[in-house]
Amino acid sequence: SPSPVPRSTALKELIEELVNITQNQKAPLCNGSMVWSINLTAGVYCAALESLINVSGCSAIEKTQRMLNGFCPHKVSAGQFSSLRVRDTKIEVAQFVKDLLVHLKKLFREGRFN
């Protein structure tokens, strides 16, 4: 069986995917869909997945959703909000992806791959 991809490599690939999304964005990402903003109680990957998994029918972020799923140790399903803070805080998917990108770049520089 193939050996698992090192976390550092997986994070680098996730960052590259987010760069692609932000750079290739022509129309509003996911038709301007909004997602819940989050805090850090579940860790960045699970928290991001819990927010983005509620966006359906948006092919542009499907790969990101799959990649985040590989980082999150527990199963995440739509409607799950364990890491969400104030449930009335919504932001655009495009902004969320942009914010996730800058944060993951920071984690990569710091060598925080988990």
Epitope: S37, I38, N39, L40, V44, I91, Q95, F96, K98, D99, L100, V102, H103, K105, K106
Partner: nanobody
């Protein structure tokens, strides 16, 4: 869209204290390093202080070290600046801003005026 809204400014006597707040919305505040920048009347922008996304690392300009304290509450999307032992030279408009190295991540508030005068 992204919004940073400062509050807490006002007129204070030399030696007094003020606490500035900055309420963030429209972006994932806990993922950003943040900071305060000020502009005195007729002067350029001066960096005051910054804090990392976790709140564990703080940095200060020499001119405010030991007097000002930066902090954040990620659960409330809010950045703070506690200003003690205020001096006339601290009079300025204080801006809350993101503190990221990446281009395209510069978000600024409208500022709040702090006047230190007797």
């Amino acid at each position: 869209g992204v919004q940073l809204l400062e509050s807490g400014g006002g007129l204070v006597q030399p030696g007094g204290s003020l606490r500035l707040s900055c309420a963030a919305s429209g972006f994932v505040f806990p993922w950003y390093d943040m900071g305060w920048v000020r502009q005195a009347p007729g002067k350029g922008l001066e960096w005051v202080s910054s804090i990392d996304w976790k709140g564990g690392k703080t940095y200060y300009a020499d001119s405010v070290k030991g007097r000002f304290t930066i902090s954040r509450d990620n659960s409330k999307n809010t950045l703070y600046l506690q200003m003690n032992s205020l001096r006339a030279e601290d009079t300025a408009v204080y801006y809350c801003a993101t503190a990221e190295d990446e281009p395209g991540y510069d978000y600024w508030g409208q500022g709040t005026l702090v006047t230190v005068s007797s």
